[in-house]
Every structure is written in structure tokens, then in C-alpha cells.
């Protein structure tokens, strides 16, 4: 931000009525009217250029200091070329002194040299030659020097002259204070600028109404420049939770907007399904039935738990069950929807039932589920299972009711035995298998059937209480086609693959081979 | 030694014209502001006109503005005034009168000048 | 236009004498005005330039002062060679105009 400067002296606004103090009296340093720009003008003037040993002063009247630390001093004026004048004024300068004396009072008109110290020898940048001065042109020179600090309770300015042709059109003293500013929604109080060059007056800021410093910001503050200006912003507010930046301020949210922490975002529209907000919101209710869970942005709409899983099927193979479903038709508006399988088995006998979740296998956990499909196996045959299988997303916790569907099955047949090839010869062939364990109480025999490979017209079954057995009288180097069935009181369970298996050609006869 | 000399005056009828010249030497004459000033008979001294040292800019008193003509030939160093419809009331000692900046110890111009050298004048009278 | 009034119209001194003519002005010149003395049948010779500068080769017993509208010419110790006619002019405005004179006789 740009310096203000706050003048403690202006000669060219004052129309030629200081009164400034000329030393020696009545020569030298005279005040003089002009005419510039059709406007009458006031100038200090001096021209003994002709004689040699000039010492001229002209001070100004006491000037207050104040709150000032550093004044500037600007000075505009014009200065003769020497060779202007007829033979060169050989005693002829184009400089003149600047001064200044401190005081604690006004010493009126008593005058004293030894007071006032020096601040710089002014020269000009441009002189008025002839034709300028001729042509009425006033060749202005700008010059601007600071002294500081300053201690006293006021001060005077000083001009000497040492034989220049010089005018003094005006004569500006001030200081610089840093403006009063508004920025990153902090105030700065107007600051008086230092008066050593190098330091920055260092200035807290203070937050707008409804403005915060953010958790772990830092706190505003500003640097006041030599210069009056602002520089090396630290730190910012940001408006509280419930208010938007609005220019230099915060502004309540509108109704129906909300915001919902301590940001520079804006405030955000309410979303789907929540009631419209107050002022100044920092949250939007969620409408009846609908919820937000705890993880969920407030600028998410309000969501509620879903509806059902759509469609349920069970298909039973053996011991087996695959359970198929589609999504909820309601999602409830959001995408985080898992599901959870849970099993109940009756005995039909009793009507008894129970949960099953710790006699059964499933293909994948399942609570948590996010496919639509898993397969339950180790299910004990002759059995009714009951499956229920429920759809809950994030808000499904903030109610009781639950989303569910069930699918029943019954188990008529075990499962279908896993059979392995334990060894061979020529003639023969050793076959072992295996079943679940809950359900081997309620096999009585397993049936082994089994026939030469495209021969479809004869077959062989063999019986057996054990896990095992080995098939003789078969012939060398041909493929056999071997199936395994457990059978119950109830009938026949679930038949194995077809397997084929070959004996060995009589070349191989000497090695078993697995 | 500056010195002006005025020729040109003499008698002539009201509607008429005349043209003074004034030659200029002792001086450069190309850094003087000149100007004629003239006196009625028994009377006191009144500005008529100035031109500045190249030629320009030029004013002129209302009683004369749009007859009169101030010129000047730097390099014959001579002044001139043309006067067309000429008056009874232009009767008068028409003098030349130069101003040197140089020989005015000021800082900043006055917003018109004074006169530092004169010539010895001439007369113009007009009468029927 | 600017109006410049001389008083006395006309004065009778001796040789010796401390003369002083006033000049006033109908409004503010600063210190832009010249003094000029003339001798019958002769072309007026500058005295004085911005109210107080004597002008080189004019004899000190002559001086000005005055500013705004005030003026005043001051011969201290008249001689022969000063009774004339002397005239003031404001350069403060382009219209450049004389006082009406004012004539210093032998007493």
C-alpha cells in the first residue's frame, strides 16, 4: 500500500504568508510574487551573483514535530545559469546549502548560524539557461532529502545561499505513515514509519469481525517501511465457520448456504435433502430419514440406508450353495454399500434351528461383502438352510431397521466325493476319495462305478464302507471311465466327476505310477 | 556602447502608413527582447508593442492590436513597425527599447519586462 | 488593464534634498515594477528594476522600495542633474504600463 504522508509544512499552499526569517535583514533571501500559468505564485528569491562572500539565510518559522520520526523535505525550484549573465559573474554559483536546528521551543527571530546543521548541498538537475529564462520557461528542479530520527519538540529548516540565482517555489515537509489497511481479512492500524532505513516496524495485525486466525496459522502481521509502505505480509485471517469472504469482510451465509469450518472456501449451497439452513449456517440438517455418517463432507447430500438386496437366488449343487443377488433398487445416494450373509440351518426331523455360520465354508467373508455373488459349501445333506443376506451402507448404523433378503435350500444329497488316482499297473488301478467330514455319519457305502472308455453298453460297481479301493482284472494300456458316489438311508448323494484313468501298457509293468 | 537608432517617422494622413525601423549595435542583438514605446506630445510615456529575441511570441496594446506589426531581422539587427490606418490620436515619438536577461538579476523572469536600453526616438505625426 | 498612479504629478526641490515619489499600483505587482527618469527631448533611462535593483551605472543615492501596490523612488541628496521627469511601470502584467509622470523642478 502506497505511504501517506502527513505534511507538517507547505510554503507553496501558505500564499506567501509565513514570514520566514532572512539573515541578514532586508538582503539576500526576498519573497516574490509571479505569475505562472495565469495563477499568482510565491518564491524565495535570491540573484547576487555579482558579488563575491555571500552568506544569505532564510529560515523557516518553527515547525512542530510531533509524532514524526523522519521527515522528508521536498524542494522545487530553479536555479540561473551562471553563463546567463553578461561576463559569466565570475562569483556566480548553481548550488545552495540545506540545513536543520532541533529545539524544544520557538526562538522567534533570534537567528543563530552555529544552531543548524547541514543536510546536503542542493544542486540542481536542470539550470534555466538565456533563452529559457527569455522564453518565461522555469526550468523546475525536484529534489527530496529525509533527516531523522528526530527528538526535539520541533525544528527548523534553513537555506543558505552562497551567491546562486536561485528561486524557492515551494517547500513541503512531512513524514510518512503506513495508511490504516485492510488485507488477508486483518486489520493494520495507521503506523508511523520508522526513522532508520533498514529497520521494518513490525505491526500485529487484527481479524475482521468473524474472521479467525486458522488452527496452526500464524498470526497477522505486517512490516511499516521507512517509506510508509507495507511489506512481508505474515500469516492471514480466515472467516469463521458460518461467514464468507466478501471483499474485505465476512459476510453471514446466505439462508440455504452453509459453511462449515474455518476457510478461505466460499459458503456452499445446502445439498440434496437436508432443510433449508438459518443465516449464518454452519451445517445443514439432514431431512427426516435421511443421515450423514460421521466420515461424510458437509457438502455431501444426506443419505439413508439402502432398501433390500433387489433379487436373491440359491442354487444348490451337492453340498453346495451358490447365492446370486443384484443391488438394492434405493441406493440410498450412496455408493458405499456392502453386504453380510448370514446362515440358519433347520433339522427336519425336529424343526430344530440354528445358526450354521461355524459349519460352513463361504468362498469369501461374509460380512463386508461388495460382490453380489458367493458360493456356501460344507452343507450337510438333508438339511433346510436358510440364507439372509443384507444390504447396509455408511448411515445403516444410525438406524435399527435392517435391509435384508432370504433365500431358503434344502440339502437332499452329499457332496460329490473328490476323487484322486493313488496308483496303477497293467491290470489294475488304486482309487482313493474323500467327502466332508460332516457328512461321512451319514454314508453307509460308497458305490464305484466304473467302464471302459467308449464302451458304452457294460459297466462295473464296485461297493465299499472305505475310502478306498483298487480295481483288478482290468486291461493293460486302456483308459477307464470311474465315478464315485456315497450312498445314505436316503438314497443316493451326489456322484463325483467322471474320471479317466489309464493302466499301464505291459512295457511300464515293473513301476507303479501315481 | 548599446546603441538604438529609430528612422521612418514623419508626417502622414489619418488611413496611412508608415514603417519604422530601428538599428541596432554595441550589443548582440539577437538575445534582446525589443519593444516600441511611445510618447504623445506633452504627455507620458505608453507600451505599444515587444517581439521576442528570435521573433516571437509578439503582444500588443489593445489602442493598436490588429493595425500595428511588430517584426525584426536578426541579421541586419533592425526592429521594425509596421503601421497601417494610421490615427490622429498615433501621433507621438515612437522609441525603440530593447531588455537584455542577462542584465536582470532575478531568478525567474517577471511575467513581462521593463526596458533597459532606448533609442533617441522618432517622430510620427498624423494629420490631413 | 493594470492602472499606475504617481503622487505628486509634480514637486520643486533644491539641490540636496531628499526627494521621495510614491507610486501606487490598482493591484498587486509583487515587486515587478521599473523606474525610469527622463530629461526634455531626450528618451527615458532605467533607474531601478524589480522595485529595488538599481541598475549598473545608476548613482546610489537612488533607490526603490516596495511590494503589492506600494511603491516609492527616493533621491537622497538631489543634484543638478536629477531634475527630470520620472516615470514608474508595472511588468507584472503584458499590458506593461507607465505612471503618468511626475516632474521634479528647481525650487
Known amino acids: 500500500a502506497q505511504g501517506k504522508e502527513v505534511v507538517l509544512l507547505d510554503f507553496a499552499a501558505a500564499g506567501g504568508e509565513l514570514g520566514w526569517l532572512t539573515h541578514p535583514y532586508g538582503k539576500g533571501w526576498d519573497l516574490m510574487q509571479n505569475i505562472m500559468n495565469d495563477m499568482p505564485i510565491y518564491m524565495y528569491s535570491v540573484c547576487n551573483v555579482m558579488s563575491g562572500d555571500q552568506d544569505n539565510w532564510l529560515r523557516t518559522n518553527w515547525v512542530y514535530r510531533g509524532e514524526a520520526e523522519r521527515i522528508f523535505i521536498e524542494l522545487k525550484f530553479t536555479v540561473r545559469d551562471c553563463n546567463s549573465f553578461p561576463g559569466g559573474a565570475s562569483s556566480c554559483k548553481e548550488t545552495f546549502n540545506l540545513y536543520y536546528a532541533e529545539s524544544d521551543l520557538d526562538y522567534g527571530t533570534n537567528f543563530q548560524k552555529r544552531l543548524f546543521t547541514k543536510i546536503d548541498t542542493i544542486a540542481p538537475d536542470e539550470i534555466t539557461v538565456s533563452s529559457d529564462f527569455e522564453a518565461r520557461h522555469v526550468k523546475l528542479n525536484v529534489e527530496e532529502r529525509s533527516v531523522g530520527p528526530l527528538t526535539r519538540k520541533g525544528f527548523y529548516l534553513a537555506f543558505q545561499d552562497i551567491g546562486a540565482c536561485v528561486a524557492l517555489l515551494s517547500v513541503r515537509v512531512y513524514y510518512k505513515k503506513c495508511p490504516e489497511l485492510l488485507q488477508s481479512l486483518a486489520r493494520f492500524p495507521e503506523t508511523i514509519a520508522g526513522s532508520d532505513a533498514p529497520s521494518l516496524a513490525t505491526v500485529a495485525g487484527t481479524c475482521v469481525d468473524h474472521a479467525v486466525v486458522p488452527p496452526g496459522g500464524e498470526e497477522p502481521r505486517m512490516h511499516c517501511a521507512v517509506d510508509g509502505e507495507w511489506l512481508v505480509p505474515i500469516g492471514q485471517c480466515l472467516c469463521q465457520a458460518g461467514y464468507e469472504k466478501v471483499e474485505d469482510a465476512c459476510q453471514a451465509c446466505s439462508p440455504g448456504f452453509f459453511k462449515f469450518e474455518v476457510s478461505e472456501s466460499p459458503c456452499l449451497e445446502c445439498p440434496e435433502h437436508t432443510l433449508p439452513s438459518p443465516e449464518g449456517a454452519t451445517s445443514c440438517e439432514c431431512e427426516e430419514g435421511f443421515f450423514r455418517a460421521p466420515q461424510d463432507p458437509m457438502s455431501m447430500p444426506c443419505t439413508r440406508p439402502p432398501s433390500a438386496p433387489h433379487y436373491l437366488t440359491a442354487v444348490g449343487m451337492g453340498a453346495k450353495v451358490e447365492l446370486r443377488w443384484t443391488p438394492p433398487q434405493d441406493s440410498g445416494g450412496r455408493e458405499d454399500i456392502v453386504y453380510s450373509v448370514t446362515c440358519e440351518q433347520c433339522w427336519p426331523e425336529s424343526g430344530e434351528c440354528g445358526p450354521c455360520e461355524s459349519s460352513v465354508r463361504y468362498s469369501e467373508p461374509p460380512h463386508g461383502l461388495t460382490r453380489t455373488s458367493v458360493t456356501v459349501s460344507d452343507l450337510e445333506p438333508h438339511m433346510n438352510y436358510t440364507f439372509t443376506v443384507e444390504a447396509r451402507n455408511g448411515v445403516s448404523g444410525l438406524v435399527t431397521s435392517r435391509s435384508f433378503r432370504t433365500a431358503s435350500v434344502s440339502i437332499n444329497q452329499t457332496e460329490p466325493p473328490k476323487v484322486r488316482l493313488e496308483g496303477r499297473s497293467t491290470t489294475s488301478l488304486s482309487v482313493s476319495w474323500s467327502i466332508p467330514p460332516p457328512q461321512q455319519s451319514r454314508v453307509w457305502k460308497y458305490e464305484v462305478t466304473y467302464r471302459k472308455k467308449g464302451d458304452s453298453n457294460s459297466y462295473n460297481v464296485r461297493r465299499t464302507e472305505g475310502f478306498s479301493v483298487t480295481l483288478d482284472d482290468l486291461a493293460p494300456d486302456t483308459t477307464y471311465l470311474v465315478q464315485v458316489q456315497a450312498l445314505t438311508q436316503e438314497g443316493q448323494g451326489a456322484g463325483s466327476k467322471v474320471h479317466e484313468f489309464q493302466t499301464l501298457s505291459p512295457e511300464g509293468s515293473g513301476s507303479l505310477a501315481v | 556602447e548599446v546603441q538604438l537608432l529609430e528612422s521612418g517617422g514623419g508626417l502622414v494622413q489619418p488611413g496611412g502608413s508608415l514603417r519604422l525601423s530601428c538599428a541596432a549595435s554595441?550589443?548582440?542583438?539577437?538575445?534582446?527582447?525589443m519593444a516600441w514605446v511611445r510618447q504623445a506630445p506633452g504627455k507620458g510615456l505608453e507600451w505599444v508593442s515587444r517581439i521576442g529575441p528570435s521573433g516571437g511570441p509578439t503582444h500588443y496594446a489593445d489602442s493598436v492590436k490588429g493595425r500595428f506589426t511588430i517584426s525584426r531581422d536578426n541579421s541586419k539587427n533592425t526592429l521594425y513597425l509596421q503601421m497601417n490606418s494610421l490615427r490622429a490620436e498615433d501621433t507621438a515619438v515612437y522609441y525603440c527599447?530593447?531588455?537584455?536577461?542577462?542584465?536582470?538579476?532575478?531568478?525567474?523572469?517577471?511575467?513581462?519586462?521593463?526596458?533597459?536600453?532606448w533609442g533617441q526616438g522618432t517622430l510620427v505625426t498624423v494629420s490631413s | 488593464d493594470i492602472q499606475m498612479t504617481q503622487s505628486p504629478s509634480s514637486l520643486s526641490a533644491s539641490v540636496g534634498d531628499r526627494v521621495t515619489i510614491t507610486c501606487r499600483a490598482s493591484?498587486?505587482?509583487?515587486?515587478?515594477l521599473a523606474w525610469y527618469q527622463q530629461k526634455p527631448g531626450k528618451a527615458p533611462k532605467l533607474l531601478i528594476y524589480?522595485?529595488?535593483n538599481l541598475h549598473t551605472g545608476v548613482p546610489s543615492r537612488f533607490s526603490g522600495s516596495g511590494s503589492g501596490t506600494e511603491f516609492s523612488l527616493t533621491i537622497s541628496g538631489l543634484q543638478p542633474d536629477d531634475f527630470a521627469t520620472y516615470y514608474c511601470q508595472q511588468y507584472n502584467q503584458y499590458s506593461r504600463t507607465f505612471g503618468q509622470g511626475t516632474k521634479v523642478e528647481i525650487k
Open positions: 554595441g550589443f548582440t542583438f539577437s538575445h534582446y527582447m
Open positions: 524589480k522595485a529595488s
Open positions: 493591484q498587486s505587482i509583487s515587486t515587478w
Open positions: 527599447a530593447g531588455y537584455d536577461s542577462g542584465y536582470d538579476y532575478v531568478a525567474v523572469a517577471g511575467p513581462a519586462e521593463y526596458f533597459q536600453h
